[in-house]
Interface confidence: low
Amino acid sequence: CPGACVCYNEPKVTTSCPQQGLQAVPTGIPASSQRIFLHGNRISYVPAASFQSCRNLTILWLHSNALAGIDAAAFTGLTLLEQLDLSDNAQLRVVDPTTFRGLGHLHTLHLDRCGLQELGPGLFRGLAALQYLYLQDNNLQALPDNTFRDLGNLTHLFLHGNRIPSVPEHAFRGLHSLDRLLLHQNHVARVHPHAFRDLGRLMTLYLFANNLSMLPAEVLVPLRSLQYLRLNDNPWVCDCRARPLWAWLQKFRGSSSEVPCNLPQRLAGRDLKRLAASDLEGCAVASGPFRPFQTNQLTDEELLGLPKCCQPDAADKASVLEPGRPASAGNALKGRVPPGDTPPGNGSGPRHINDSPFGTLPGSAEPPLTALRPGGSEPPGLPTTGPRRRPGCSRKNRTRSHCRLGQAGSGSSGTGDAEGSGALGIRKGNSADIQHSGGRSSLEGPRFEGKPIPNPLLGLDSTRTGHHHHHH
C-alpha cells in the first residue's frame, strides 16, 4: 500500500489516499484494488497506463486535484470501471478524444468544473453503459452533432453553466433513454426544430436562463414523456411567431415555469402561457433578428420553421406598434390548464399524460411510483397523424397559426393546429435514490462521504466526499 494511502479489503478492495498533498499518482497501488480514491490532492498529470495493473477497478476518484493533462492511455485496461470522477480540475481544459475508449462498463462520468472548452469528436464513443454524464460548469461553447450518439443508456445529461449558444439538429442524437437534460444557464438562443427528436423518454428539460426569444413548438413535440419544463429567464418575443409555442403550452400536461414575455413592450413581463390567442398578433420586431445556424442555403424562416415575421393586416399594425395599447385580459388561465380540454360549460380543463394534440396516444398501465423508471416499459410511440396543414400566410404554405389570428376559419383558440407533447404524467424523483449528507452543488450525482455506504441504485459500496448526489 502506498505510504500516503490506507488500504483495506472490506467491503471492497480499496486504496484510499484523499487529501494527502500528493502531486502524482502514487506507485505501488495494489493490483487487486477495486476502488481508488485520490481526490483532494495536487496531482497535475495522469500518465499512460497509470492503473493498468488494476484490472478489477470499478471506482476511480480523481476529482479536486490540479489536473492539467491526462494521457490518452491513462485508463487503458480498466474494462470494469464503473465510476470515473475527474471533476473540479479547472486546469484540465482539454481531454483527448480517445481517453475513455474501452471503458465499456462505465456508468458515471464526472467532467464537471474542468474548464473544458470543447468536446472533441468521438470523446464519448463506445460508452454504451454510461448513465450519468456531468459536464456542467465548464466553458463549452458548442455542442457538436453526434457527440453523444453512442450513449443509448444515458439517463442524465448535465450541461448547465456553460456557454453553449445553440443546439444543432443532431446534438442529442441517440439519447433514447435520456430522463433529464439540464441546459439552463447557457447562452442558448436557438434550438434546431429536430434537436430533441430522439428524446422520447425525457422527463425533465431545463432551458431557463438562456437567450431564447422563440422556440418552435416542433422542438417539443417528440418529448412525449416530458413532465418538467423550465423556460423562464429568457427574452421571449410574444408575437405571432410565439403562437405555436403558446398552443403547445396550452396542451402540455406537466409542470412548466412561467414564460415571461420580453417583447412586445405592451406584453413585457406577462406570462406567455396566460395570454389570450388574440394577444399574439402581428410582429414585435420588423425583421427577424434570429440567424440560428450559419448556412447559405436556408433562411431563418426555413430553419426555425417559422416565418421571419407574420405580416399583419393594416388594421393590426397599430395594435402591434403602439406600446400604449392596453393588453388583452388574457384567458384567465389558472394554474397550468389548457383550453383544449375544456368541457362544455365547465371552465378550464387539465393537463394529461400523453396528451398530444395530434390524437390519442396508446396508453399503458402505470407502474407504482417507486418503480416507474425511464428504462422500464417502452413509452407510447409517436402518433401517426401529423399536424394538419392549411394554406398559409405567405409564399409558402404555413399552418394558420403563423398567420394573423382571427381570420375566418383560423379559429382563435389555437387548439386546432396546436403542436403538443404527449406528456407522460411523470415527475422527477425516485425513492430508490439515496440522499447522503453534504451537498456542494446542485443537480448532480453519485458521491458519498464517510465510511462506505451501500447505494441500492448503483449496487456498489462507495465512499466519497459528499458533494454530488444521485437523482432521477
Epitope: 439552463h184 422527463m203 431557463f208 413532465q227 418538467y228 423550465r230 423562464n232 400536461r253 406537466g254 409542470s255 415555469s257 389558472k334 394554474g335 397550468r336 390548464v337 383544449g340 380540454d341 368541457p343 365547465n346 371552465g347 378550464s348 380543463g349 387539465p350 393537463r351 394529461h352 399524460i353 400523453n354 396528451d355 398530444s356 394534440p357 390524437g359 390519442t360 396516444l361 396508453g363 402505470e366 411510483l369 417507486t370 416507474l372 404527449g422 404524467g425 411523470i426 415527475r427 422527477k428 424523483g429 425516485n430 425513492s431 435514490d433 439515496i434 440522499q435 451537498g439 446542485s442 443537480l443 448526489h469 444521485h470 437523482h471 432521477h472
Partner: antibody
C-alpha cells in the same frame, strides 16, 4: 426510505411570523419538488404551493401568496415555509409532502407541524 | 379552481364488509386525448399524515393492498375497499392532480362498527 421530518408543535402570537421546517432524507433532495399543505382542525387539505429545490423556483396557490414563502437549504436538505402576519385563522397542521414522479401526486408526507396562533 | 366533493362524510362498517366512497369534481378530470383521469386517493389514519393509495383514478401505489380499488371517470370517482380491515380505520381524501392549485375533497371518515 424517504423521510420528511417536521417539528411537532409551534405556538406563535397573532401578527408574528413562523418558519416551519421539513428535513428530507432517504432520497436526493434536489430531485423532487416539495409541496406544502394546510389542514385545519376537522377539515380537508389545502394546497399552499410547491418549490423546486434545485433552484428554488416556486409555484403558489393564489390564496396563499403573501402569506406563505417557500425556501430550501440544499446543504441541509431542508425545506422551509415562512408564514407571516399570523391570525387565529392560520392555526392548523402544516404538512410538507414530496412531489412524486407523477405530476402533482404527493408520494411521501411529513408528520405535520401543528401551528397554534394564540395570544 | 376545481372543487372536489366527497360523500358520504362518514360511514361505519364491520370488518370484512365492502366499503364504497365517492368523489366528484366540478369539472372533468379526464383527458380527451389519453383517457387518463387525474385523480388520487389518500388515506390518513388518526394522528398521522396522509398516505398515497391511488393515482390516475385506478393505479395503486406500490405496497398498497389490492383490496383498495379506485375507479371512475370524468367527474365521478369511487374508492372501494373490497373487504375492510381494522387497520383501514382512517379518513380518505380524494385529490385532483389535474392542475394547480391542487384541491382535495373534505374527506370520508371510515369508522368500524
Amino acid at each position: 426510505q424517504v423521510q420528511l421530518q417536521q417539528p411537532g408543535i409551534e405556538v406563535v402570537k397573532p401578527g408574528a411570523s413562523v418558519k416551519l421546517s421539513c428535513k428530507a432524507s432517504g432520497y436526493t433532495f434536489i430531485s423532487n419538488w416539495m409541496h406544502w399543505l394546510r389542514q385545519r382542525p376537522g377539515q380537508g387539505l389545502e394546497w399552499i404551493g410547491e418549490i423546486d429545490p434545485s433552484d428554488t423556483y416556486t409555484d403558489y396557490n393564489q390564496k396563499f401568496k403573501g402569506k406563505a414563502t417557500l425556501t430550501v437549504d440544499k446543504s441541509s436538505t431542508t425545506a422551509y415555509m415562512l408564514l407571516s402576519s399570523l391570525t387565529s385563522e392560520d392555526s392548523a397542521v402544516y404538512f410538507c409532502a414530496r412531489g412524486g414522479m407523477i405530476v402533482y401526486v404527493l408520494d411521501s408526507w411529513g408528520q405535520g407541524t401543528s401551528v397554534t396562533v394564540s395570544s | 379552481d376545481i372543487v372536489m366533493y366527497q360523500s358520504p362524510s362518514s360511514l361505519a362498517m364491520s370488518v370484512g364488509q365492502k366499503v364504497i366512497m365517492n368523489c366528484k369534481s366540478s369539472q372533468s378530470l379526464l383527458s380527451s386525448n389519453n383517457q387518463k383521469n387525474y385523480l388520487a386517493w389518500y388515506q390518513q389514519k388518526p394522528g398521522q399524515s396522509p398516505k398515497l393509495l391511488v393515482y390516475f383514478a385506478s393505479t395503486r401505489d406500490s405496497g398498497v393492498p389490492d383490496r383498495f380499488i379506485g375507479s371512475g371517470s370524468g367527474t365521478d370517482f369511487t374508492l372501494t375497499i373490497s373487504s375492510v380491515q381494522a387497520e383501514d380505520l382512517a379518513d380518505y381524501f380524494c385529490q385532483q392532480h389535474y392542475t394547480t392549485p391542487l384541491t382535495f375533497g373534505a374527506g370520508t371518515k371510515l369508522e368500524l362498527k
